[in-house]
């Protein structure tokens, strides 16, 4: 049993870390595979992380930790029973992915306007809350070729589009996405898309 | 009341052994990690060893290290210190002291906060 | 390994006066933010060491509110507001940032 491609792991700056890897061959994750960590810190003790299975070859771990802070780092240990796999470090506040934003609702109650929220998905005390940015994503499932990504550079988890920007009687899906520019961190997955019909009509003397 | 309470202690000739223990109550003595400190007559304190809460993890200062054994018995609440290859240098007060508490991720210090009436080991011919 | 220095190693002072003893690291004692592993204890004559303050300015159980710790990095200061006739004794400041933990030479407050 070996490891193809190395563990590489990504923190979500809060309590998860999440670490994937690919295996020489087809396995049952968490039936043959331990992914053994420990802070490197005074008195810390080894814990354990039973490993899923991603696709055939593909394991994927979820590591419960503290909060993050910089000095922060972690062995890791990759076993298969008793024998050692693969053996490394890593340290979480310079491997950061964000949390994806939650609760994306559109509201088109608004007069003329489209106006998109979305949640932060940090709480206040976290150093992420204040240093996200984020990237919107609207698509038209009626018209393939309109897809647009708003980027969202201030704090405020809000987007504001004119409705006249958008084709009237047709259906519209959006989803956002974030990153801290400060954390030099990756982007965070997209969060669940929500979708909304376009009834805006422009004022007669308007078309 | 949370309490430790040391033994063990005694005189014996250089090149000899003592096993001091330290009996824990009033407090989930797994969950912490543990330390011992002695103070030799007249001086400072000094640090000697700790242990983690599940015993796994030992740290020994240089001067003790290859003679010294920290372990514990979490099922008796019960500290050890081994002392093999004794010097007259080794002579001082052993006190144990509850650590920090090792089973969260990053464990949580809280200070020694709770230290036992040490126990005097004697080195001499 | 981390050398703590104390100063001063003798501290008489009268009742009612304030008091104060520094302890300074040979490296940083900073973790993280508000996080420095750095404890004071005190030791009364014929007595086990106590502690006062740990991660720098945390207060243990039960300690009066006239001592105090402050300082981050390196540099660290234990203040008395107040003597009492009660706080005779010596003084040590320690690091827990990792082993080896190592202790100040201690300092010994005195009644004038």
């Known amino acids: 049993m070996k490891v193809l491609q190395e563990p590489a792991c990504v923190s979500d700056y809060m309590s998860i870390s999440t670490c994937e890897w690919k295996m020489g061959g087809p396995t049952n994750c968490s039936a043959e595979l331990r992914l053994l960590y420990q802070l490197v810190f005074q008195s810390s003790e080894t814990h354990t992380c039973v490993p899923e299975n991603n696709g055939g070859v593909g394991c994927v771990c979820h590591l419960l930790m503290d909060d993050v802070v910089s000095m922060d780092n972690y062995t890791l240990d990759l076993w298969a029973g008793q024998q050692l796999l693969w053996k490394g470090s890593f340290k979480p506040s310079e491997h950061v992915k964000p949390r994806a934003p939650g609760n994306l609702t559109v509201h088109t109650n608004v007069s003329d306007t489209v106006l998109l929220t979305w949640s932060n998905p940090y709480p206040p005390d976290n150093y992420l809350y204040n240093d996200l940015t984020y990237a919107v994503n609207i698509w038209s499932e009626n018209d393939p070729a309109y897809s647009r990504i708003h980027n969202v550079t201030y704090l405020k988890p809000t987007l504001r589009i004119p409705a006249s920007t958008l084709k009237s009687g047709i259906s519209y899906r959006a989803r956002v996405r974030a990153w801290a520019q400060h954390y030099n961190t990756t982007w965070s997955e997209w969060s669940p898309s929500t979708k909304w019909y376009n009834s805006y009509r422009e004022p007669f003397e308007q078309r | 009341e949370v309490q430790l309470v040391e033994s063990g202690g005694g005189l014996e000739q250089p090149g000899g052994s003592l096993r001091l223990s330290c009996a824990g109550s009033?407090?989930?003595?797994?969950?912490?990690?543990m330390t011992w400190v002695r103070q030799a007559p007249g001086k400072g304190l000094e640090w000697v060893s700790s242990?983690?809460?599940?015993?796994?993890?030992?740290y020994y200062a240089d001067s003790v290290k290859g003679r010294f054994t920290i372990s514990r018995d979490n099922s008796k609440n019960t500290l050890y210190l081994q002392m093999n290859s004794l010097r007259a240098e080794d002579t001082a007060v052993y006190y144990c002291?509850?650590?920090?508490?090792?089973?969260?991720?990053?464990?949580?210090?809280?200070?020694?906060?709770?230290w036992g009436q040490g126990t005097t080991v004697t080195v001499s011919s | 390994d981390i050398v703590m220095t104390q100063s001063p190693l003798s501290l008489p002072v009268t009742p009612g006066e304030p008091a104060s003893i520094s302890c300074t690291s040979s490296?940083?004692?900073?973790?993280?933010?508000?996080?420095?592993?750095v404890d004071w204890y005190l030791q009364k004559s014929g007595q086990s060491p106590q502690l006062l303050i740990y991660?720098?300015?945390k207060r243990a159980s039960g300690v009066p509110d006239r001592f105090s710790g402050s300082g981050s990095g390196t540099d660290f200061t234990l203040k008395i507001s107040r003597v009492e006739a009660e706080d005779v004794g010596f003084y040590y400041c320690?690091?827990?940032?990792?082993?080896?933990?190592?202790f100040g030479q201690g300092t010994k407050l005195e009644i004038k």
């Open positions: 320690m690091q827990a940032l990792g082993s080896p933990y190592t």
């Open positions: 490296q940083s004692l900073l973790y993280s933010i508000g996080y420095n592993y």
């Open positions: 991660l720098g300015n």
């Open positions: 009033g407090f989930t003595f797994r969950t912490y990690a």
């Open positions: 002291a509850k650590d920090r508490v090792s089973i969260t991720i990053r464990p949580r210090y809280y200070g020694l906060d709770v």
């Open positions: 242990i983690s809460g599940s015993g796994d993890n030992t």
